[in-house]
């Protein structure tokens, strides 16, 4: 039975030009993360193996930077970076949990960010 | 030991559609890519995609993008390329090769198969 | 796409001699994060697949002997064999696999001379 819960710093803002951390936190569980999928509506992002490491995807490597920890940061973000990103911890025993952040990346200077959520 | 082994050869007419497969053995099939290169007769070597089975996230080349899927099951292990609406440029011998693209080790395509040699003609 | 471009096409070097193969990219193939260049090198035999020899542009894989070596950074590089036995003639190919698509250059024919 998966029993645990991805927390994730949720609906964020951000100012374009900018950079933000897209961080997911999976607790409740004793479950071993093996590795964690960063994905952008399907397309992936960067990879973190247990066992391998990083791999940031070629199509990112000039915008994207692993972490801190499992996190990952954005950076020189466009108006195009605005849209849903995906945490996806593949554990064992438990199973996948998916954790699901929104972002908008502003034009002008306001840029709040949003109350943390929780997915089980 | 890693290997990859790939299905046989291939006589096809122009038009139709090829599935290559690539079988992995001895190493962790969902945390690599698995990549196909094709070579034409005499020719160098041409990148066609890959795929990362642990996500099933594939990336493809523009040249062959309209044509070619790549799949990947995990329960056995196997790599597929289908490449459709062939033609006689389509005749080649196409590799299957184990991607390392992690930012620690990078050992770019490690493993290869055997290759399988796909022939279009009327 | 990144452009790669090999020299010679083929190449005749005496056994023991050195040979020496270039690749130049149109772009620079240097992450800064682990400041790695993300080019490698193959060595193919004919009837046979693609053999990798150095990645990382100067990392040789296990296995292979040290008189392979590579070098360079950026968008310029180079393969050497320091002393060229007979089981070294064969196609080299560089490969760049910093962004999609990947790709190769056309390759240097290497001959005992």
């Known amino acids: 039975m998966m029993t645990g819960t991805i927390e994730t710093t949720g609906n964020i803002s951000a100012e374009k030009g900018g950079s933000i951390i897209l961080q997911c936190h999976l607790s409740s569980t004793t479950a071993q993360v093996t590795q964690v999928n960063w994905e952008q509506q399907d397309q992936l992002l960067a990879i973190c193996n247990a066992d391998l490491g990083w791999h940031i995807s070629p199509s990112f490597k000039d915008r994207v930077a692993p972490g801190p920890g499992l996190g990952l940061t954005l950076q020189s973000l466009t108006v195009n970076d605005t849209g849903e990103y995906f945490c996806i911890y593949h554990t064992y025993p438990d199973g996948t949990y998916t954790g699901r952040i929104f972002l908008e990346v502003l034009e002008s200077s306001v840029a709040e960010h949003g109350a943390r959520f929780q997915i089980p | 030991e890693v290997q990859l082994v790939q299905s046989g050869a291939e006589v096809k007419k122009p038009g139709s559609s090829v599935k290559v497969s690539c079988k992995a053995s001895g190493g962790t099939f969902s945390n690599y890519w698995i990549g196909w290169v094709r070579q034409a007769p005499g020719q160098g070597l041409e990148w066609i995609g890959d795929i990362y089975p642990g996500g099933a996230y594939t990336n493809y080349n523009e040249k062959f993008k309209d044509r070619v899927t790549i799949t990947a099951d995990k329960s056995t292990s196997t790599a597929y390329m289908e490449l459709s609406s062939l033609r006689s440029e389509d005749t080649a011998v196409y590799y299957c090769?184990?991607?390392?693209?992690?930012?620690?080790?990078?050992?770019?395509?490690?493993?290869w198969g055997q290759g399988t040699l796909v022939t279009v003609s009327s | 796409d990144i452009v790669m471009t090999q020299s010679p096409d083929s190449l005749a070097v005496s056994l023991g001699e050195r040979a020496t193969i270039n690749c130049k990219s149109s772009q620079s193939l240097l992450y800064s994060r682990n400041q790695m260049n993300y080019l490698a090198w193959y060595q193919q035999k004919p009837g046979q697949p693609p053999k990798l020899l150095i990645y990382w542009t100067s990392t040789r894989e296990s296995g292979v002997p040290d008189r392979f070596s590579g070098s360079g950074s950026g968008t310029d590089f180079t393969l050497t064999i320091s002393s060229l036995q007979a089981e070294d003639v064969a196609v080299y190919y560089c490969?760049?696999?910093?962004?999609?698509?990947?790709?190769f250059g056309g390759g240097t024919k290497v001959e005992i001379k």
């Open positions: 490969q760049q696999y910093y962004s999609y698509p990947y790709t």
């Open positions: 090769a184990r991607g390392d693209y992690y930012d620690s080790s990078g050992r770019a395509m490690d493993y």
